[in-house]
């Protein structure tokens, strides 16, 4: 029997039942290779509470349709007196990526999963040349899912200070150049997930091979390698490779675009601080609303409830389905059953079944999917209790006053599936919006203006037009809602601009769209504020103008008009200046745009060196000066000593030329002991200094990701911006 979904065959997939602390391993084409589950297990269940393993699906006992895969076992299970076999059921839906299997529910006998994946699509429109699994579970069974970052067309431009080259990447899959309007990517070879553009030429520097890996808590790594044999002539004999490290931001660092942290010998190291690297809580509720602090999620489906005897009706060929959410169906022939979903046979309306009961309800927000599950319906002939799964989709323009209507999509073993497009399922994800703008290779980053939490305070705009008695206070945050503190305490929760006067507070707009570059300035538009009459809502425009060296000045109110429906602010700030690379001398560097100066000379050791010890080597490093440690060469800025035989390598000659770009200070030592390759490439060292105000001097850390380049990172308070 041919594999039903060949794209999914190369990997063993994972799904989790968080409530019961159970990890499932799934291999849909072969076996999972877990001894405790036996040689032919396709679905292996690991109960972490009891530390036991059970096979809940056998690869030999597989049956498949276009949208359903069932794995039976020979193990008996007892459900309400009927004798069944344990089985797993995976319902497939068309998705835009390979996706992830999602645990839905489990009964005594059946383990239900749902999987939105390109493999289940009738057409190949979303299928990739190369794609790898893009999620992982950590030790606490929390899911880290990068699927939302996958681009279906185009690519991400990696932030790099080199004006002559551009590195484009996709996440977990190759770059689709055909559907991308940007001409730069057209030349990228098929299959590449990392494409280096130099002039009019494009080179494949990495293709996806292995799935996403969790290397540390909240640090995910994706590695791309070049499959082709031929070497690239600018790589000094090395094979190109790309390592992307996704980092969950701490409170101090918000999401960013991918940043190149090292690129010696075509070994490209990229760091991407993104909320998608954080674990995504599975939010569940037994009511019709749920909220999750971490994801900034708030969902309330109660407006969808029907009352006064009416229900939603969904046509299912042989059957009609009467549904209500957040309440029972109140139609005559269903109400004795306490049904939320009621199934009525068209040809014989006396045949009525509850396809899920109101009091057996679970609302789940998981990885961007909003699902309402009703359990415990009437039994099918097999003894299983009917169940309904409603998948909600956000649709801001849904009919029926935004409520929309449920649509029956199919039935799998007495489980009934519906989709429901409604505006009440719209959830704004923070990470969807960037707090910056791009104009070709020019980058603008407004994140320095964001106020996150106390003790920080909102920006207050200057308004010279009013007398003290009629004074309005205008509180503004950038790419974030205003902090509810001080005079802004009463501001509406999701307002990004808020006006406060003696009559109360007003929402002047929410952060709904990313900043844009317009006419040399950055424009930030906040919309969907409070009502201002005639069915209109208040809108605010902020024009940010580059003012080098100034991150302190406040925004100024320029105009307010259209009967209080429109406000315009102007803000002269260094955050609106283009990011540029600057070089310095004598262990100092000055960022003229932002007005920051950095001096790392306190890190220079007059005698000795900083030591980094690994199992095989000792590394000695100095900052802006030579290491004075035997057996290192006297002029080396960094040196490597083998523990086994004290063999020594110079990792680069010392210098004091710091470079600064977008919050990263770097020191490059070149011209070390040559490698033993055809080109005899000299060894080099790159030290990246990162700001941490508590670190003091700090110490160097070796990044063990790549053996052919020597990359160190160094947290230090001396890398934190100081006003000159």
């Amino acid at each position: 029997q041919a594999a039903p979904f060949p794209e999914l065959c190369s990997y063993t997939w994972e799904a989790v039942d968080t409530k019961n602390n159970v990890l499932y391993k799934i291999n849909i084409c072969g076996s999972v290779d877990i001894v405790q589950c036996g040689p032919s297990s396709a679905v292996c269940m690991h109960d972490l509470k009891t530390r036991t393993y059970h096979s809940v699906g056998d690869s030999v006992l597989r049956s498949a349709t276009r949208s359903l895969l069932e794995f039976n076992t020979t193990v008996s299970c007892d459900q309400q007196g009927t004798n069944h076999r344990v089985q797993s059921s995976i319902a497939f839906l068309c998705g835009k990526t390979l996706g992830t299997p999602e645990f839905v529910t489990a009964t005594e006998c059946v383990h239900y999963f749902e999987w939105r994946t390109t493999a289940a699509c009738k057409k190949d429109i979303f299928k990739a040349n190369k794609e790898v699994p893009c999620y992982v579970f950590d030790e606490e069974l929390r899911k880290h899912d990068l699927n939302p970052l996958i681009k279906l067309s185009g690519a991400y431009l990696v932030d790099d200070s080199d004006p002559d080259t551009s590195l484009f990447i996709n996440v977990c899959r190759d770059i689709d150049t055909l559907r991308d309007p940007g001409s730069q990517l057209r030349a990228c070879p098929p299959g590449t997930a990392a494409c280096l553009v130099r002039g009019h030429q494009a080179f494949d520097v990495g293709q996806p091979r292995d799935g996403l890996k969790l290397v540390r808590k909240d640090r995910l790594v994706l590695s791309y390698v070049r499959e082709e044999a031929g070497k690239l002539d600018f790589c000094d004999g090395h094979s190109p490779a790309v390592t992307i490290t996704f980092v969950c931001p701490s409170e101090r660092r918000e999401g960013t675009i991918p940043k190149l942290t090292a690129k010696s010998n075509c070994r490209y190291e990229i760091e991407w601080i993104t909320e998608y690297a954080c674990h995504r809580d599975y939010l569940e509720s037994k009511t019709c609303s749920l909220s999750g602090e971490q994801q900034d999620v708030s969902i309330d489906l109660t407006p969808l409830a029907q009352s006064g005897g009416s229900s939603y009706i969904s046509d299912g060929k042989e059957y009609l389905f009467y549904l209500n959410v957040c309440g029972e169906t109140e139609i005559q022939f269903c109400n004795k059953k306490q049904a939320a979903v009621c199934q009525v046979k068209k040809s014989d309306t006396s045949q009525v079944k509850a396809a899920g009961r109101y009091h057996n309800q679970t609302l789940r927000y998981s990885d961007g999917d909003l699902t309402l599950i009703y359990f415990g319906g009437d039994e099918c002939s097999s003894g299983f209790q009917r169940m309904s799964v409603i998948n909600f989709e956000c649709n801001k323009t849904a009919g029926n006053d935004g409520k929309g209507t449920p649509v029956f999509t199919g039935e799998v073993d007495c489980t009934y599936f519906f989709t429901w497009d409604t505006e009440y399922a719209c959830v704004k994800e923070k990470e969807d919006l960037l707090c910056g703008a791009t104009d070709g290779k020019k980058r603008y980053d407004l994140s320095a203006l964001v106020r996150h939490a106390e003790p920080e305070q909102n920006w207050e705009a200057v308004d010279g037009s009013q007398t003290e008695t009629e004074k309005k206070h205008f509180f503004i945050n950038i790419c974030h809602r205003v902090l509810q503190e001080g005079k802004a305490r009463g501001c509406p929760e999701d307002a990004a601009v808020c006006a406060v006067d003696k009559n109360g507070s007003k929402n002047l707009g929410k952060f709904i769209s990313s900043p844009m570059k317009e006419k040399g300035n950055i424009q930030l538009s906040y919309s969907d504020g409070d009502d201002c009459g005639h069915g209109k809502k208040i809108k605010t425009n902020i024009t940010l103008v580059c003012k080098p060296g100034d991150l302190e000045s406040a925004p100024v109110l320029r105009t307010s008009g259209e009967g209080g429906c429109f406000y315009e602010f102007e803000w002269h700030t260094a955050a609106a200046c283009v990011l540029s690379k600057t070089e310095g001398e004598n262990c100092t560097v000055f960022d003229s745009q932002a007005g920051f100066s950095f001096d790392l000379s306190p890190l220079t050791k007059k005698n000795g060196a900083y030591k980094v010890e690994t199992k095989k080597y000792d590394f000695y490093i100095n900052v802006c000066g030579p290491v004075s440690v035997s057996p290192c060469q006297p002029d080396s800025g960094a040196c490597q000593v083998a523990k086994s035989d004290e063999k020594t390598w110079n990792l680069g000659l010392s210098n004091a030329k710091l470079s600064y770009y977008d919050g990263m200070i770097q020191l490059n030592y070149r011209g070390g002991t040559p490698y033993n390759n055809e080109r005899h490439t000299p060894r080099a060292t790159l030290i990246t200094f990162l700001c941490d105000r508590d670190a003091g001097v700090g110490f160097p850390e070796y990044q063990e990701e790549d053996n052919s380049t020597y990359n160190f990172r160094w947290y230090t308070s001396y890398a934190c911006p100081e006003e000159p």
């Epitope: 540390r216 980094v612 941490d692 110490f699 070796y702």
Partner: nanobody, 123 residues
Framework: EVQLVESGGGLVPAGGSLRLSCAAS????????MGWFRQAPGKERKFVAT????????YYADSVKGRFTISRDNAKNTVYLLMNSLKPEDTAVYYC????????????????WGQGTQVTVSS
């Protein structure tokens, strides 16, 4: 897999001393650099000290330099933190952590963590 168990915390007057211990299970203890971190209520986890796998390299946070000493005994699979001249601002839960191969300042780079031991310094 490495499991870490801290002990030695408690209540101590300002100026007093404590010695924290962190016992590791597993035969590969000497493959790991070890670190001590602390977390006060409502605050982020902060670096305190780190020691390389052999014990040959140690680094400390500025706030504890000269007062705290980190050491390890690979034969006993244990790492220690000797805390002298304790101050009320040293009050926190102290965590022991293990990182494969080499040391780091960043708590997110550590592979294994203990459950923590409470240290309270009264004024």
């Amino acid at each position: 897999e490495v499991q870490l168990v801290e002990s030695g915390g408690g209540l101590v007057p300002a100026g007093g001393s404590l010695r924290l211990s962190c016992a590791a299970s597993g035969r590969t203890f000497s493959n790991y650099a070890m670190g001590w971190f602390r977390q006060a209520p409502g605050k982020e986890r902060k670096f305190v000290a780190t020691i390389s796998w052999s014990g040959g390299v140690t680094y400390y946070a500025d706030s504890v330099k000269g007062r705290f000493t980190i050491s390890r005994d690979n034969a006993k699979n244990t790492v220690y933190l000797l805390m002298n001249s304790l101050k009320p601002e040293d009050t926190a839960v102290y965590y022991c952590a293990a990182k494969r191969d080499s040391s780091s300042y960043d708590h997110r780079r550590y592979d294994y963590w203990g459950q923590g031991t409470q240290v309270t310094v009264s004024s």
